[in-house]
Interface confidence: low
């Protein structure tokens, strides 16, 4: 019975831990600066790294821009957004700006798609400051199914801060679903 | 058999109990402000409580002003930054002001630091008013190994919320590493 | 003793399922948008959706405006909330204002109430522009007691975005208290 | 009711110098960008000249080093200086504030340059 | 500098008539780009900026569409005090830069 019951946690401990980290999916994605957009309408961004630098994936997809959801559970969503523009980029547009995040759930299934979190601000960047900088952080607990896409939504997309430090997003399994 | 079984069990809900406890470092820190640096440059914060009202740590080190990883894994980090002015402080040295922080990982086998994390903004903090506020908040999720050092620096730190409720970073472990 | 042990990994396969479940209370509440305080004054926001779009919770309460927690642990908390104004509502009271978030834990054994999180920003929202939207993140990690009561408040509630993407705050369990 | 009310244009020979000046009231007038546009008769618009809320000056090519755009806040006044005028300089000019756009016309002041 | 085409560069139409107007920019403007019109020995008045936005005052038979660097204006149905000259505008960088004009005449 000792050798059947050190089977018993010796396979248990196997499938904990194979079932354990086979039921938490994450993904942390950092912006593909060699695509960014241009402009200040509001665009889904496409472009992102998922295997350098910081940027990884494990149980879920990253596809056509998208972070698609390989297993149904409830996660914790983010995303920090970074804006800059210096004087010698050459001159806004128009000082007043509205610099957005988005991030957005698709389903497939039901061609929808849906804002899950936005954050941002309205700015005045005056020709007074050689240099301006802005920072957005949204994060919220959403239950998502197999198959749904996380997509980034942003404004100004050519202010984007292209550092793998400042523009990202990502996501992390913390429970299954009931 | 069924004595062997509840043995089995017990046994196993208290490894489980264990290695799930174990498996799960955390700390929350927040800002002593009993030694905060002055002037506007940028520098690392060092002063940091982790054992009074809502500041805590388990199975990680908080040593030399830096958060000390002991367990291989992936973590979730975040900083919430607060500065604030009031002009009974005196007059600041510029109106124009760099508000920023900055979450980085030093490695002490390859001694190198990288900044994991960024967050801010430009802010014009004009004479007309007589208080100013302004929070930053980050958060992330990252692979950290036993041994690396996470610390946070700042731009300003003079112009700190010296409150535990405003200025404060912290990570808890979400997975092991496969 | 195969069958003993396929009962003994069936009869704790429900066990840990049906655990780690109990173990892993959450909430995201989304404002209430036909009960927003009107005002500039602080307040705490009582009027919070639990079930409806975004909004959802399993092993917590939602009662009297408070998130109260039903079992001991270390918890994750979050809010999100933005500020918005369009000069077709009218003019404002005054240009300058100072837009907060407070995060607040109660305690019913020993009637407190104490900050967890503050976040926020003085604003000059000048009539130059047409449009302006503010938004304020914040998190962090915490130990939790049963009976214990999250709330939030607010400055200047009459300019909260009421949308669900917008104005949320929650929380899940993380951990158990060793 | 935002107002722009220019002044200034005048007849003046080649190589001359003359002073357009632009007043605004209803609106603050230091938090916008400003600019001046002009206009060459039986022509269409030509943007010559900006000065942003901070003080940054812009001009189109053709006027460098020749015009000169400034701002006095605390009579909620726009300038803009204009020397060694050639007859290509004749137009009808116009200010204009700038936020989204050039939302705000003034109604345009006429400058001729002949000898 | 971008340039701003304008077609057509003049058109005849009658009151009623839907109308429509475009501009294409020599480079992606994003939605930086503003309507003008201008009557005879007036100042131009903005009707559209940030290509479909419209401007406070203007009626809603004036709109504007477009993004990057094909841009529209429609008036939906003429009335006798649309007949005038309308300007496309980029304001995506230094220096803005107009169309042409187009030359919006009664049969």
């Known amino acids: 019975i000792r050798a059947e019951k050190a089977m018993v946690d010796g396979s248990w401990l196997d499938l904990a831990k194979r079932s354990k980290l086979e039921a938490q999916p994450f993904a942390h994605l950092t912006i593909n600066a060699t695509d960014i957009p241009s402009g200040s309408h509001k665009v889904s961004l496409s472009s992102w790294y998922h295997d350098r630098g910081w940027a990884k994936i494990s149980n879920m997809t990253f596809s056509n821009g998208k972070l698609i959801v390989n297993q149904d559970g409830f996660y914790y969503l983010y995303a920090n957004i970074c804006f800059r523009h210096h004087e010698t980029s050459g001159d806004l547009a128009t000082e007043y700006l509205q610099l957005m995040v988005y991030v957005t759930k698709t389903s497939i299934k039901i061609p929808s798609s849906h804002t899950l979190m936005k954050g941002g601000s309205t700015k005045y960047w005056s020709g007074n400051s050689e240099f301006h900088f802005y920072s957005i952080n949204v994060g919220g607990f959403f239950k998502l199914r197999s198959g749904e896409e996380i997509s980034i939504e942003v404004s100004n997309p050519s202010l984007l801060d292209p550092d793998q430090d400042a523009t990202y997003f990502g996501a992390f399994k913390v429970r299954d679903i009931d | 058999i069924r004595a062997e079984k509840a043995m089995v069990d017990g046994s196993w809900l208290d490894l489980a109990k264990r290695s799930k406890l174990e498996a799960q470092p955390f700390a929350h820190l927040t800002i002593n402000a009993t030694d905060i640096p002055s002037g506007s440059h940028k520098v690392s914060l060092s002063s940091w409580y982790h054992d009074r009202g809502w500041a805590k740590i388990s199975n990680m080190t908080f040593s030399n002003g830096k958060l000390i990883v002991n367990q291989d894994g992936f973590y979730y980090l975040y900083a919430n930054i607060c500065f604030r002015h009031h002009e009974t402080s005196g007059d600041l040295a510029t109106e124009y002001l760099q508000l920023m922080v900055y979450v980085t990982k030093t490695s002490i086998k390859i001694p190198s630091s990288h900044t994991l994390m960024k967050g801010g903004s430009t802010k014009y903090w004009s004479g007309n008013s007589e208080f100013h506020f302004y929070s930053i908040n980050v958060g992330g999720f990252f692979k950290l190994r036993s041994g690396e050092e996470i610390s946070i620096e700042v731009s300003n730190p003079s112009l700190l919320d010296p409150d535990q409720d405003a200025t404060y970073f912290g990570a808890f472990k979400v997975r092991d590493i496969d | 003793i195969r069958a003993e042990k396929a009962m003994v990994d069936g009869s704790w396969l429900d066990l840990a399922k049906r655990s780690k479940l109990e173990a892993q209370p959450f909430a995201h509440l989304t404002i209430n948008a036909t009960d927003i305080p009107s005002g500039s004054h602080k307040v705490s926001l009582s009027s919070w959706y639990h079930d409806r779009g975004w909004a959802k919770i399993s092993n917590m309460t939602f009662s009297n405006g408070k998130l109260i927690v039903n079992q001991d642990g270390f918890y994750y908390l979050y809010a999100n909330i933005c500020f918005r104004h369009h000069e077709t509502s009218g003019d404002l009271a005054t240009e300058y204002l100072q837009l907060m978030v407070y995060v607040t834990k109660t305690s019913i054994k020993i009637p407190s109430s104490h900050t967890l999180m503050k976040g926020g920003s003085t604003k000059y929202w000048s009539g130059n522009s047409e449009f302006h939207f503010y938004s304020i993140n914040v998190g962090g990690f915490f130990k939790l007691r049963s009976g214990e009561e999250i709330s939030i408040e607010v400055s200047n509630p009459s300019l909260l975005d009421p949308d669900q993407d917008a104005t949320y705050f929650g929380a899940f369990k993380v951990r158990d208290i060793d | 009711e935002v107002q722009l009310v220019q002044s200034g244009g005048d007849l003046v020979h080649p190589g001359g110098s003359l002073r357009l000046s632009c007043v605004g009231s209803g609106f603050t007038f230091s938090h916008y960008p400003l600019h001046w546009v002009r206009q060459a008769p039986g022509k269409g618009l030509e943007w010559i000249s900006g000065?942003?809320?901070?003080?940054?000056?812009y001009y189109t090519d053709s006027v460098k080093g020749r015009f000169t755009i400034s701002s006095d806040n605390a009579k909620n006044s726009l300038y803009l200086q204009m020397n060694t005028l050639r007859a290509e300089d004749m137009a009808v000019y116009y200010c204009?504030?700038?936020?989204?756009?050039?939302?705000?016309w003034g109604q345009g002041t006429l400058v001729i340059v002949s000898s | 500098d971008i340039q701003m085409t304008q077609s057509p560069s003049s058109l005849s139409a009658s009151v009623g008539d839907r109308v429509t107007i475009t501009c294409r920019a020599s480079q992606g403007i994003s939605s930086w780009l503003a309507w003008y019109q201008q009557k005879p020995e007036k100042a131009p008045k903005s009707l559209i900026y940030a290509a479909s936005s419209l401007q406070s005052g203007v009626p809603s038979r004036f709109s504007g569409s477009g993004s990057g660097t094909d841009f529209t204006l429609t008036i939906s149905s003429l009335q006798s005090e649309d007949f005038a000259t309308y300007y496309c505008?980029?304001?995506?960088?230094?220096?803005?830069?107009f169309g042409q004009g187009t030359r919006l005449e009664i049969k």
């Open positions: 204009a504030r700038g936020r989204n756009s050039f939302d705000y």
């Open positions: 000065i942003h809320t901070g003080g940054g000056t």
């Open positions: 505008q980029q304001y995506n960088s230094y220096p803005p830069t």
